[in-house]
Amino acid sequence: FERTRSLQDPCSNCPAGTFCDNNRNQICSPCPPNSFSSAGGQRTCDICRQCKGVFRTRKECSSTSNAECDCTPGFHCLGAGCSMCEQDCKQGQELTKKGCKDCCFGTFNDQKRGICRPWTNCSLDGKSVLVNGTKERDVVCGPSPADLSPGASSVTPPAPAREPGHSPQ
């Protein structure tokens, strides 16, 4: 690597994947093995992340980017950059401090992560329950009782399912 020539900061020309080596008269030196610098002008390289234990390597480290981790089977990522792995539960359960617990009556979880959420209250939309809810599935709302009066069409499509993570208003 050439000696940097910047008049302000001689380190500013050191590209990603290198560091400005004060021990070598501020020459841009490549990051040592198992380290990286993702931006230019760095005075040190950061040690690569180890994806082990409950983590697995999704992408190995390079001189310009940190390793990326995901989680071993039975766990899922939480936090920015998969900073934590959280245990999966079965559908119809949620994770508590004491482990996976079944959803209480009137709530459901259709994923292996997240919390149990209340069934949709069909009557709030003036509709009736077409299909009962379970621990794993929300209720399906159908047409309102008035819509089912003689001569009324009964092919009204059910209300769209709520997005995961949203509670009823």
Partner: antibody, heavy 115, light 107 residues
């Protein structure tokens, strides 16, 4: 579930060649580095080769004991790791393991070099 | 190359005993050290990574510690299934190197 399955071992004469394969599944193969480690009968473990992924230009590294005789390679489209072994010596007799991330190992394939 | 000097090479102990195995690195490895257990005819099994972190699913009687370039694997109370050969490995610097192994036998 991560699986590493080695194949290609067998009996070969000194000076001969053999190509080992390791079929990988259950993880993202093409962005990960991979290793070959061997174990001679009744002996300890010896790391012999490593290949990095595309982001590291498929860089390869070898133990001195196999340098210039063995070649590690990979086919990311097939999720397969290879070890081409040439000019084999009797001291290359060993179980050969492919390895990912220290935690994951294949069952091993036995290579016997004997006249 | 970094040499990993493992001791003892063999060890006799009884069920319930506390056992320690040590590995000394000839140079700095930044705690990038793994401990493995291997049983005859089987692949090595990772026990400890990063010198002190327990691999998922490994019993808590196994632990690792580090002091400078000296590394220790401790089994707090030996169980019948723990009789095996143990290896340390540094994965900081290529060539990656293993200790010579410690064969743990029943007394």
């Amino acid at each position: 579930e991560v699986q590493l399955v080695e194949s290609g071992g067998g009996l070969v004469k000194p000076g001969g060649s053999l190509r080992l394969s390791c079929a990988a599944s259950g993880f993202i193969f093409n962005t990960n580095a991979m290793n070959w480690v061997r174990q001679a009968p009744g002996k300890g473990l010896e790391w012999i080769a490593r290949i990095r992924s595309k982001i590291n230009n498929y860089a390869t590294y070898y133990a001195d004991s196999v340098k210039d005789r063995f070649t590690i390679s990979r086919d990311d489209s097939k999720n397969t790791l290879y070890l081409q072994m040439n000019s084999l010596k009797t001291e290359d007799t060993a179980v050969y393991y492919c390895n990912w991330d220290e935690a994951y190992w294949g069952q091993g394939t036995l290579v016997t070099v004997s006249s | 190359d970094i040499q990993m000097t493992q001791s003892p090479s063999s060890l006799s102990a009884s069920v319930g005993d506390r056992v320690t195995i040590t590995c000394k690195a000839s140079d700095h490895i930044n705690n990038w050290l793994a401990w493995y257990q291997q049983k005859p005819g089987k692949a090595p099994k990772l026990l400890i990574f990063g010198a002190t972190s327990l691999e998922t699913g490994v019993p808590s009687r196994f632990s690792g510690s580090a002091s400078g370039n000296d590394y220790t694997l401790t089994i707090s109370s030996l169980q019948p299934e723990d009789f095996a050969t143990y290896y340390c490995q540094q994965y900081w610097s290529i060539p990656y190197t293993f200790g010579q192994g410690t064969k743990l036998e029943i007394k």
